[in-house]
């Protein structure tokens, strides 16, 4: 017997949720109050021409992971309202451009992981002006991108290409997309690569390779007539690199002008850092690149890496770098110093320690750097790490939060500049006059501190949720504050008398504290109004601790008794 | 403060396997890798391999690779080392040791001692 | 393999000498001009303790009468006034290529 519609559980806004119910087939009896349908994961095999024809207001229809192999040429004629559709990871072998042709306000369509070879023979896309998301291919059977295959298409905000095991490419095919603003790759093998490229030069704005292996990619020089202006990032992920395909790979930005930003998320180098220089030498300058970052890259052979010298010369522009969970425990001093514009450096969940951190923060190591973010590294010493960085003269922003600090010495060094500290889940237990006068920022939430008595003149927020603190800081310590959050501390109960002696503060987040509700406390919390407005977690996060009979309820709506407020 | 705990002695038969844990506490087990060294009696200490927790990638030594597993259970800050096809050379202590700065072991555990006689 | 040769095999030295301990790598352990080279202490029936990383880098909580120098192939350990606790095995350790590997060591013991 065919599945009823319900077989669906819908909410009153048209939204039905049919996901992994072993459907064989679309319910019968849709009207026109659907709005959105989702039969994801099911055993739908085919797609009929009556089985939609009532949803006329259908605006998103989600038919990804079934097994459908056939759809009638009409099926979604009646769907003029519709603006996603996903049609992914079922076996379509064939694909029609007569599905489409009614879907005139299609936004998003997605045919990635059918077992199609081509797009087929007449443009899919032709009738769909308002397509801003496409995704098309897969990983084992599409062969070939056609000349025709994105005519009528003149702007995508995302194309996602599967194409593992692409064999040709007709020249010019991407050239009649004017304007790509993420184009997403899958590409195991990339001989192709340079062909595609050139047709983008024009049209894209951020490239994205994933699962690329580039072991034996040799980018062959191309004619082009100027490099691309409006191409602003490149990302590699999941990609496999040699010290000689790093060249080849770099040869790419060549073909860009203006501020670039290049990722390598999860990537694996199989190679000793052993960069020709030859090779490099024919590159210019990537005095394109301003931003670098790099997550996750795997080197086997990490501690047999070369002299990195030979690419030194490619960064001095670089302005933004990020190396994060990489295995980085020391950056070379020369290198520091080559990285002349730096201005923000994370080294974040590596492996720094205070020690080696002074080789890489070495006299005129990072002249221009005002940002440092060395959060959960192998630092352990606060007294170490502020000394090791007074080289950096303009450093103002430094996190080394989640590092094992545990303990303050009395007196530190820092930069003259710092103004933002991030210390927190560091272990610490009290502060100290170590902490910079010059603050203005200071977060040190997540630590084992049981009170604030220090003064910091210029500090202007003050994160120190997740503590052990019984009481609101004095004012007269941080006559500047305008943010303190200060919630899942102990505090048993706070005053209007002390609110209003920190005149400047504007926000306060002080929930999830163990609030004792007595008459006085709800009396000035309940009646004023303007509380509201500096509370910003008021008031779902404010509840009572006691009196036990009142222990779990909000403080906004708790009563007690005459008796219990005039004893 | 920092601790590596390690499981108790061992007396296995030639051609057998042993699995030796080491516990850890007193740090974010996961930012911090876990190598295993043996020490032979009255011999030197020579380095079997690391684990890192955070993503599970190891390193060996070469002598070790086709006997030794270092696995890791990171919701019980937990390494173990597992040695196959045992022969008497194999009698050693075996430390585990915190890995800091990528290149130094700043804390040790006590050590366990794997006897291995027919 | 990189191969740590550690001399002399015996140190034996009366309290308040000084006591020098060398360890000489088979090729450099430079690493972008840090050396990759540490010393650890053992006592009989204890783990070893780290005494010195990054060739001079003195770990927390050692007393300041220990120090290490040297770079490239040639690195000396430096007790500048024996004590009766010092007593026990010195060893090196380089950790700049794989395997990473451990000098014989030097025992040093009081008169």
């Known amino acids: 017997a065919p599945h009823q519609a319900s077989s669906l559980s819908c909410d009153p806004a048209g939204v039905c949720d049919g996901r992994s119910r072993s459907l064989s087939s679309i319910p019968s009896g849709l009207t026109a109050a659907v709005k959105s349908l989702d039969l994801s994961n099911n055993r739908i095999a085919y797609v009929g021409s009556s089985d939609l024809r009532k949803c006329v207001n259908l605006r998103a229809l989600r038919l990804g992971a079934n097994s459908i192999h056939t759809v009638e040429e009409d099926s979604f004629s009646s769907l003029g309202s519709l603006e996603h559709l996903d049609l992914s990871y079922n076996h379509l072998s064939n694909l029609s451009s007569s599905w489409f042709k009614s879907l005139s306000t299609l936004k998003f369509l997605n045919l990635l992981g059918n077992p199609y070879k081509t797009l087929g023979e007449t443009p899919l896309f032709s009738h769909l002006p308002n397509l801003r998301i496409l995704k098309i291919g897969n990983n084992d059977t599409f062969a070939e991108i056609q000349a025709k295959d994105f005519q009528g298409l003149t702007f995508l905000q995302e194309l996602e290409i599967g194409a593992s095991h692409l064999q040709r490419y007709a020249p010019k095919s991407l050239r009649s997309i004017q304007n790509i603003s993420h184009l997403i790759l899958h590409m195991r093998r990339p001989a192709l690569l340079p062909k595609i490229f050139v047709d983008l030069l024009s049209s894209l704005e951020y490239l994205e390779l994933r699962n690329t292996d580039f072991s034996t990619f040799n980018f062959s020089d191309v004619s082009i007539n100027e490099p691309s202006t409006v191409m602003k990032k490149f990302t590699f992920r999941k990609a496999e690199i040699t010290d000689a395909s790093f060249t080849e790979i770099v040869k790419l930005l060549n073909y860009v002008s203006g501020a670039l930003e290049v990722e390598f998320d999860d990537c694996t180098l199989n190679g000793r850092g052993d960069f020709s220089t030859s090779a490099l030498d024919t590159i210019k300058s990537l005095g394109n690149v301003e931003t670098l970052t790099v997550r996750r890259l795997h080197i086997p052979q990490f501690f047999l890496f070369y002299d990195l010298r030979s690419i030194y010369s490619l960064t001095g522009a670089v302005k933004r770098i990020t190396i994060e969970n990489s295995k980085v425990f020391l950056v070379p001093c020369s290198l520091s110093q080559h990285l002349k514009s730096l201005e923000y450096l994370d080294l974040s969940e590596n492996l720094m320690s205070e020690e080696y951190l002074k080789n890489s923060a070495c006299e005129h190591a990072w002249p221009f750097l005002h940002t440092l973010i060395l959060r959960q590294n192998h630092l352990k010493s606060l007294e170490k790490t502020g000394e090791v960085l007074v080289t950096l003269k303009n450093l103002t922003n430094l996190d080394i939060s989640k590092n094992n600090f545990d303990s303050m010495p009395e007196t530190c060094q820092w930069p003259e500049k710092m103004k933002y500290l991030n210390l927190s889940s560091t272990r610490i237990h009290s502060l100290t006059h170590c902490l910079p006068q010059t603050l203005e920022v200071l977060d040190i939430s997540n630590n084992n501190l049981n009170s604030f008595s220090l003064s910091l003149p210029q500090l202007k927020e003050l994160y120190i949720s997740r503590n052990k603190l019984k009481t609101l800081p004095d004012a007269s310590f941080l006559p500047m504050l305008s943010v303190l959050r200060i919630s899942r501390n102990t505090i048993n109960t706070f005053s209007k008398e002390q609110l209003d002696s920190f005149q400047k503060l504007k926000t306060l987040e002080a929930g999830g504290n163990n609030f004792i509700c007595s008459c006085d406390f709800l009396s000035f919390t309940q009646g004023q109004q303007a509380l509201a407005q500096v509370l910003s977690d008021w008031p779902e996060n404010y509840l009572c601790d006691s009196p036990s009979h009142v222990r779990g309820q909000r403080v906004q709506d708790t009563r007690l008794s005459l008796t219990e407020c005039h004893r | 403060q920092v601790q590596l705990v390690q499981s108790g002695s061992e007396l296995k038969k030639p051609g057998a396997s042993v699995k030796l844990s080491c516990k850890a506490s007193g740090f974010t087990f996961t930012t911090y890798g876990i190598n295993w060294v043996r020490q032979a009696p009255g011999q030197g200490l020579e380095w079997i391999g690391w684990?890192?927790?955070?993503?599970?990638?190891?390193n060996f030594n070469e002598n070790f690779k086709d006997r030794a597993t270092i696995t890791v259970d990171t919701s019980a800050s937990t390494a173990y080392m597992e040695l196959s096809s045992l022969r008497s050379e194999d009698t050693a202590v075996y430390f585990c040791?915190?890995?800091?700065?990528?290149?130094?072991?700043?804390?040790w555990g006590q050590g366990t001692t794997v006897t291995v006689s027919s | 393999d990189i191969v740590l040769t550690q001399s002399p095999a015996t140190l034996s030295l009366s309290p308040g000498e000084r006591a020098t301990l060398s360890c000489r790598a088979s090729e450099s352990v430079e690493y972008y001009g840090t050396s990759l080279m540490q010393w650890y202490q053992q006592k009989p029936g204890q783990p070893p303790k780290l005494l010195i990383f990054?060739?001079?880098n003195v770990e927390s909580g050692v007393p300041d009468r220990f120090s290490g120098s040297g770079s490239g192939t040639d690195f000396t350990l430096k007790i500048s006034r024996v004590e009766a606790e010092d007593v026990g095995m010195y060893f090196c350790q380089q950790s700049r290529k794989l395997p990473w590997t451990f000098g014989g060591g030097t025992k040093v013991e009081i008169k």
């Open positions: 684990i890192y927790p955070r993503d599970g990638s190891t």
């Open positions: 040791a915190r890995l800091t700065g990528g290149t130094f072991l700043d804390y």
């Open positions: 990054g060739a001079s």
